[in-house]
């Protein structure tokens, strides 16, 4: 007997072919011998089966000896053995209908778990194999669990259900609610305007929630809330902002914050949290601010950086067009009695310049 796998909610064609390529008498029954559909003259007739209002046949194919039954909007309980009676012979087709659904909302926060549940007919023993958009393979039986969703798990998951050497494929769209980056660092010279951007890694038609930026300045003993805001249908409105610094916030997505001036006392790291309406948990993005200052005081030329820098970063003082250089893996470098000319202070990582500040040393007569 032929086995056909179907998907819940889908449409399936159960084929039945006669040897004569001509219109002939046929009818379809279920395993209880209840008529589903058949032919009377040129008319398609329906029987008393529960399936009748969802069953159909293609008249144009009857002349080709093809008497298929099409079942729309499949249900798990449609799983049965169907019998096509044509030309005094019986053809049996076993239909197995499966459903695969996410146990919760398919919009999940990064770090949350995803569970996919397989609905299957009694007596079946299917196996399920799912592939994430990033190429991760997960296998299971009636349930498949992904304990900790990551950003790269966003997209279409393809799940293959296998039974009796036949397969049926499900596609489930999963949206992982997260910021595009887990962390970002902004490098600025003292006095420059600072732009912080927090792009989201997803799009939703209606995006509503509230957020806050907490800041831990390097020089401060405790963190403080710099700004709180609301998000309503992708429109941003500031609720509360500190007086120092006086942050400005863009009214549209992506979330955008402007610090009028980079000052040593602001250098540090912040944590932007966003709580979305009807979601438990919060989205997080870490942001770091590194500030550079170059100063000359009497016979001392100093370059300093504040904020979270890695120990492998190099701070250098270099006289333009001359070989004179002082480099350290430290947060401050200095030159005593510097030569006159344009000096550059450079913060670099493996030769890549992250931040530079120029200071002119004038000759002392």
């Amino acid at each position: 007997k032929k086995v056909v796998l179907g998907k819940k909610g889908d449409t399936v064609e159960l084929t039945c072919n006669a040897s004569q390529k001509k219109n002939t008498q046929f009818h379809w029954k279920n395993s209880n011998q209840i008529k589903i559909l058949g032919i009377q003259g040129l008319f398609l007739t329906k029987g008393p089966s529960k399936l009748s209002d969802r069953a159909d046949s293609r008249k144009s194919l009857w002349d080709q000896g093809c008497f298929s039954m099409i079942i729309k909007n499949l249900k798990i309980e449609d799983s049965d053995t169907y019998i096509c009676e044509v030309e005094n012979k019986k053809e049996e087709v076993e239909l197995l209908v499966f459903g695969l659904t996410a146990n919760s909302d398919t919009h999940l926060l990064e770090g949350q778990s995803l569970t996919l549940t397989l609905e299957s007919p009694p007596g079946s023993s299917p196996s399920v194999k799912c592939r994430s958009p990033g190429g991760k393979n997960i296998q299971g039986g009636r349930t498949i669990s992904v304990p900790q969703l990551e950003r790269q798990d966003s997209g279409t998951w393809t799940c293959t259900v296998s039974q009796d050497q036949k397969t049926v494929e499900f596609k489930i769209d999963i949206v992982v609610l997260a910021f595009q980056k887990a962390s970002s660092t902004v490098y600025k010279k003292e006095g420059e305007q600072v732009e912080f951007s927090f792009p989201l890694a997803f799009t939703l038609e209606k995006l509503t929630g509230s957020g806050e930026l907490w800041w831990q300045a390097e020089r401060a003993s405790s963190s403080k809330s710099w700004i709180t805001f609301d998000l309503k249908n992708k429109e941003v409105s500031v609720k509360r902002v500190t007086q120092d610094p006086k942050l400005q916030m863009g009214k549209k997505l992506p979330l955008h914050l402007t610090l009028p001036q980079a000052l040593p006392q602001y250098a540090g790291s912040g944590n932007l949290t966003l709580a979305l309406e009807a979601k438990t948990g919060k989205l997080h993005q870490e942001v770091n601010l590194v500030v550079m200052r170059a100063t000359q005081f009497q016979e001392n030329l100093t370059c300093e950086v504040w904020g979270p820098t890695s120990p492998k970063l190099t701070l250098s003082l270099k006289l333009e067009n001359k070989g004179a250089t002082v480099s350290k893996q430290a947060k401050a470098v200095w030159v005593l009695n510097p030569e006159a000319g344009m000096w550059q202070c450079l913060l670099s990582d493996s030769g890549q310049v992250l931040l530079e500040s120029n200071i002119k040393v004038v000759p002392t007569w």
């Epitope: 998907k7 909610g9 889908d10 449409t11 399936v12 064609e13 003259g41 040129l42 008319f43 159909d56 293609r58 008249k59 144009s60 002349d63 099409i70 079942i71 729309k72």
Partner: antibody, heavy 115, light 107 residues
């Protein structure tokens, strides 16, 4: 809610091959047949042919020698190729889902054949 | 091929009128017939299938009848949005064929 979206070249020269593709979004792809129908400006509708998910086709005998309909099930897409076009092939071409009746339809693509 | 002949090819009527369009098949097609409505620049829309069954969402003022070779589409009380072209289609055998259309115009 099933939606059909179609695209392809709108301006052809005589003897060229018309090529259109239709993508199916939402609903079942495998249980139905997928058709191409055309309508010359100000005229009636003409069925071109159909295909199912496994590639089984039926064509209008009047066009059969020039028509190829193909399917890419993994993308829920099907395509029409009509070779050696002439000015008489100028029409709005529609894709549609069919069991016995055509529903829903694509938005239509005007194909003009002109030298 | 089965020929489908619609009559009239055009009809003028007013809002509130009852309008009847007929479709004749060149051979017996039982009830394998559908009716479509088409507005300028748009794709046809299925109204009636299997000669007399309503497609979901179609107003009840539209009705279909007939079997064998003669079929009728009736609009009981014309509404402004009903002014369009109507086509019949047979699904009895390949190739599927359509009537030439009936244009329903405002009087």
């Amino acid at each position: 809610q099933v939606q059909l979206q179609q695209w392809g070249a709108g301006l052809l020269k005589p003897s060229e091959t018309l090529s259109l593709t239709c993508a199916v979004y939402g609903g079942s792809f495998s249980g139905y047949y997928w058709s191409w129908i055309r309508q010359p400006p100000g005229k009636g509708l003409e069925w071109i042919g159909e295909i199912n998910h496994s590639g089984s086709t039926n064509y209008n005998p009047s066009l059969k020698s020039r028509v190829t309909i193909s399917v890419v099930t993994s993308k829920n897409q099907f395509s029409l190729k009509l070779s050696s076009v002439t000015a008489a092939d100028t029409a709005v071409y529609y894709c549609a889902r069919v069991l016995n009746w055509f529903d829903p339809w694509g938005q239509g693509t005007l194909v003009t054949v002109s030298s | 091929d089965i020929q489908m002949t619609q009559s009239p090819s055009s009809v003028s009527a007013s809002v509130g009128d009852r309008v009847t369009i007929t479709c004749r098949a060149s051979q017996d097609i039982a009830d394998w017939l559908a009716w479509y409505q088409q507005k300028p620049g748009k794709a046809p829309k299925l109204l009636i299938y299997a000669a007399s069954s309503f497609q979901s969402g179609v107003p009840s003022r539209f009705s279909g009848s007939g079997s064998g070779t003669d079929f009728t589409l009736t609009i009981s009380s014309l509404q402004p949005e009903d002014f369009a072209t109507y086509f019949c289609q047979q699904a009895n055998s390949f190739p599927y064929t359509f009537g030439q259309g009936t244009k329903l115009e405002i009087k």
